[in-house]
């Protein structure tokens, strides 16, 4: 807290300019009018204030707007945004995507801070849903943003927003998140033709069920091993050797290198060895010839 002192003669700020960098904290407090600061916030970002000085400017704005800053001020906060606490931000009503972009720009290159997380939360809640433009903006600044949301939060993403998602945006998503996103992506891309559809849906396939993988195997998609390894184990297990061969196309040879890893390992254990042998890859661990395979889960379902 800066002590309350009278502004020295001749030092009253008539505008926000670089001469203020020479002011002490108490002088900024005494000589800069909060209303002037609010109307000239766009200048603050161009002036090399110290963090100590920014503290004073923030304090002045806090006094002027105890219920929270208006968006006209928020949009021009610049580096002053870094001084805001999540509690400060919860008082704001940010509706403009331009304001959001301006503040995200300040934090660019850094991990998502609690301030940024709160800002995004306030913005998205204010909009009611995560629309395409917002998602586009957020993933541009934070490629991992989508995967930071809970499955419940992801459920509010409209299918139309899926068009904004890039493959790298899904890199850190877990199966539960992909379970929510995959049906949305399937719906979003449903009118695309086979090869184009596969290119778009590929990143979301970690949430695909068995029947969709079977359907894809009939379309000569040539899925790469990296995508295959991200598929749900329970979705891969029912696939036949022939279906996996069609699904992977020329990439099927990569199964050998992955035979000890899930889901390939678990899938191999479910296949007949003589079916695996038809691949000519030397995959071992399948069910020996002459053995009967009982699907206990099917038996339980029937009883």
């Amino acid at each position: 807290e800066v002590e309350k002192t009278a502004c020295p003669s001749g030092k009253k700020a008539r505008e926000i300019d670089e001469s203020l960098i020479f002011y002490k904290k108490w002088e900024l407090e005494a000589c800069v009018d909060a209303a002037l600061l609010a109307t000239q916030m766009d200048r603050v970002n161009a002036i090399p204030f110290t963090y100590e000085q920014l503290d004073v400017l923030k304090h002045k704005l806090d006094e002027l707007y105890p219920q929270g800053y208006p968006e006209s001020v928020i949009q021009h906060l610049g580096y002053l945004f870094l001084k805001m606490s999540p509690e400060d931000i919860r008082k704001w009503n940010v509706t403009s995507l331009e304001t959001l972009k301006a503040l995200l720009e300040v934090n660019k290159g850094h991990e998502m801070s609690p301030q940024v997380a709160t800002l995004i939360d306030r913005f998205v809640k204010g909009r009611g849903q995560l629309d395409k433009d917002t998602l586009d903006t957020l993933t541009a600044f934070y490629p991992g943003y989508l995967c930071s949301l809970s499955p419940e939060e992801l459920s509010s993403v409209p299918p139309s927003s899926i068009w904004a998602v890039r493959p790298q945006d899904l890199d850190t998503c877990d199966p539960r998140q992909l379970d929510v996103l995959y049906p949305k992506a399937r719906l979003a891309f449903q009118n695309m033709n086979g090869s184009e559809y596969f290119v778009k849906i590929q990143s979301f396939l970690g949430g695909a069920p068995t029947e969709d993988l079977k359907a894809l195997s009939q379309q000569n998609v040539s899925m790469d091993l990296a995508t295959f390894m991200k598929l749900r184990t329970d979705a891969v297990l029912p696939l036949t050797v022939a279906e996996v061969q069609k699904l992977l196309g020329p990439h099927v040879e990569g199964l050998k290198a992955e035979e000890r890893h899930r889901p390939v390992r678990d899938w191999i254990l479910r296949q007949r060895q003589d079916d695996l042998d038809t691949l000519g890859l030397g995959l071992q661990g399948g069910i020996p010839n002459g053995y009967l395979v009982l699907d206990l889960s099917m038996q339980e379902a029937l009883s």
Partner: antibody, heavy 121, light 107 residues
């Protein structure tokens, strides 16, 4: 290790302009963490602050000298300069350049060796 | 402008003595005060800033105290290399102003 070195004529005629340059070595004058200043000390008298400058060119002067003083910066040469116009014998002094860390309770932490300037015809 | 008045203007002391120099500001300056040491023909050297913070590399026998208008520089045990002139300076508001110095001489 940052060092400052003043340079300029040691003798200036009355009514002329005193010009001094301070060269910063061992560090960049363009650091956002410092102001750069000029201070003078007339023989046997008190130290007097002349003014400060930031690498952007923004400056701040002693009101008693403001009408006659100009401090400028040349970041490409890592130098800042002092010009004092219409000099009189009262401007005879040792002139120091110094570094001032930017902070609320700042103080001149590095000084040049000082250069004696005599105003005489 | 803020006028800084130092006292005494000079003093004589012996090695090992405790020496106290005072500086008074013409108005309150909180703790915006620095102390410098200057030896004959040499450059002023920063000892203390913010009234009591010791500058890096300065011996701990030097200490500063005070706030508002009255400040003190203390040398707990005077050493031969401490014989010099000491200046105070306020940085509360521009123009920055200096005291006219206290000369510490050998008794």
């Amino acid at each position: 290790q940052v060092q400052l070195q003043e340079s300029g004529p040691g003798l200036v005629k009355p009514s002329e302009t005193l010009s001094l340059t301070c060269t910063v070595s061992g560090g960049s004058i363009s650091s956002s963490s410092y102001f750069w200043g000029w201070i003078r000390q007339p023989p046997g008298k008190c130290l007097e602050w002349i003014g400060n400058i930031y690498y952007s060119g923004s400056s701040n002067y002693n009101p008693s000298l403001k009408s006659r003083v100009t401090i400028s910066v040349d970041t490409s040469k890592n130098q800042f300069s002092l010009k004092l116009s219409s000099v009189t014998a009262a401007d005879t002094a040792v002139y120091y350049c110094a570094r001032l860390p930017r902070g609320d309770r700042d103080a001149f932490d590095i000084w040049g060796q000082g250069t004696m300037v005599t105003v005489s015809s | 402008e803020i006028v800084m008045t130092q006292s005494p203007s000079s003093l004589s002391a012996s090695v090992g003595d405790r020496v106290t120099i005072t500086c008074r500001a013409s108005q309150g300056i909180s703790n915006y005060l620095a102390w410098y040491q200057q030896k004959p023909g040499k450059v002023p050297k920063l000892l203390i800033y913010a009234a009591s913070t010791l500058q890096s590399g300065v011996p701990s026998r030097f200490s500063g105290s005070g706030s508002g208008t009255d400040f003190t520089l203390t040398i707990s045990s005077l050493q031969p290399e401490d014989f010099a002139t000491y200046y105070c300076q306020q940085s509360y508001s521009t123009p920055f102003t200096f005291g006219c110095g206290t000369k510490v001489e050998i008794k």
